[in-house]
C-alpha cells in the first residue's frame, strides 16, 4: 500500500464531535468550529484540520466561527462565541475571501 504523502509534523488535538473516532486526533492543525443551524442551539466541535486553512481566517458571523491553532491539544479549552445578529441583507455561509 502506498505511503500517504508527508504533511510535515502532525499535531495532536482534542476531538469532540459526533464523528470523532476517539478523544484525540492528529492533523496539520487543531480546530474549533462553533455552528448554529437555524432553529437550533449553537454546537461546538473540536477536531483536526488538514485542508482549507483559509477557513481559519474567516471572520465570525452569527452562524459560524472557526478557530485554528498549532500546538499540542491547543483546542482543548477554547470557547468561541458568535457575532451579534446581522442585518437582514447578510446571509449565512458567505464567502470567506
Amino acid at each position: 500500500d502506498p505511503v500517504k504523502p508527508s504533511r510535515g509534523p502532525l499535531v495532536t488535538c482534542t476531538c469532540e464531535s459526533p464523528h470523532c473516532r476517539g478523544p484525540t486526533c492528529q492533523g496539520a492543525w487543531c480546530t474549533v468550529v462553533l455552528v448554529r443551524e437555524e432553529g437550533r442551539h449553537p454546537q461546538e466541535h473540536r477536531g483536526c484540520g488538514n485542508l482549507h486553512r483559509e477557513l481559519c481566517r474567516g471572520r465570525p458571523t452569527e452562524f459560524v466561527n472557526h478557530y485554528c491553532c498549532d500546538s499540542h491539544l491547543c483546542n482543548r479549552n477554547v470557547s468561541l462565541v458568535l457575532e451579534a445578529t446581522q442585518t437582514p441583507s447578510e446571509q449565512p455561509g458567505t464567502d470567506s475571501q
Partner: antibody, heavy 118, light 108 residues
C-alpha cells in the same frame, strides 16, 4: 459506499438562476473531514472549479464566478446546493458535485447537463 | 491564483508503451495537495493519484506520480487499452483549487 447525485432542471433560460442540488448517501455531510464542491465542464472542454462548502456553512468560490454563485448546505437532508445567477449560454455545461478529502476529490456525482437557452 | 499547465495536449502511443504526462505550476505548490484524475467520455473524473505520488484506492500500480515544487509527472508504465482517456492534474485543499487543461492520451 459513498454516492453523490446531482438533481435539477436540465434547461434554464438566459438571465435566470441555475439551481442544482447534490444529495449525499452512504456518508454524513456533517463530517469535519470533508469539503463539498461543485465543478463544471463546458462541452468538449476542461474542468472548472466553482466553489466549496464546509458542513459549517462556510464557503469559498472561484473568483471568476464569485459574484454570481451561492452554495448552501442542508445537513439535516445530507444535501448541498448550487445557485448560479444571471446565466448565459456560456454557462451551458455538465455540472458535477464532488467530495474533497485529504486524498483529493475522491467521490463524484455522475454529472448533470444544464443547457442555457430560450 | 495558481495556474497548472499540462503537456503535451495530446499524446499518441500504443498499448504496452510508457506514457509520461507533465503538469507545471505557475508557482511552487505543496506535494500534499497535487492530484491526478482520469476521465473517459460521458463519465465523471476518477481520482488516480493524490499527494503527488500516492495511488488512490483501487488504482493499478502501473500508474505512478512524482515531482515537487512546480513540476509534476504522471507515468503509466505499460499502457492498457482502457488507459486511453483524458488526464487532469489538480491543486486542491487550499483557496485556489485549479485544474490543468488536460492531456488527451490517444491510441497511435
Amino acid at each position: 459506499q459513498v454516492q453523490l447525485q446531482e438533481s435539477g432542471p436540465g434547461l434554464v433560460k438566459p438571465s435566470q438562476t441555475l439551481s442544482l442540488t447534490c444529495t449525499v448517501s452512504g456518508g454524513s455531510i456533517s463530517s469535519g473531514d470533508y469539503y463539498w464542491n461543485w465543478i463544471r465542464q463546458h462541452p468538449g472542454k476542461g474542468l472548472e472549479w466553482i466553489g466549496y462548502i464546509y458542513y459549517s456553512g462556510s464557503t469559498y468560490y472561484n473568483p471568476s464566478l464569485k459574484s454570481r454563485v451561492t452554495i448552501s448546505v442542508a445537513t439535516s437532508k445530507n444535501q448541498f446546493s448550487l445557485k448560479l445567477s444571471s446565466v448565459t449560454a456560456a454557462d451551458t455545461a455538465v455540472y458535477y458535485c464532488a467530495r474533497e478529502a485529504t486524498e483529493g476529490f475522491d467521490y463524484w456525482g455522475q454529472g448533470t447537463l444544464v443547457t442555457v437557452s430560450s | 491564483e495558481i495556474v497548472l499547465t499540462q503537456s503535451p495536449g495530446t499524446l499518441s502511443l500504443s498499448p504496452g508503451e510508457r506514457a509520461t504526462l507533465s503538469c507545471r505550476a505557475s508557482q511552487s505548490v505543496s506535494t500534499t495537495y497535487l492530484a491526478w484524475y482520469q476521465q473517459k467520455p460521458g463519465q465523471a473524473p476518477r481520482l488516480l493519484i493524490y499527494g503527488a505520488s500516492s495511488r488512490a484506492t483501487g488504482i493499478p500500480d502501473r500508474f505512478s506520480g512524482s515531482g515537487s515544487g512546480t513540476d509534476f509527472t504522471l507515468t503509466i508504465s505499460r499502457l492498457e487499452p482502457e488507459d486511453f482517456a483524458l488526464y487532469y492534474c489538480q491543486h486542491y485543499g487550499t483557496s485556489s483549487i485549479t485544474f490543468g487543461q488536460g492531456t488527451r492520451l490517444e491510441i497511435k
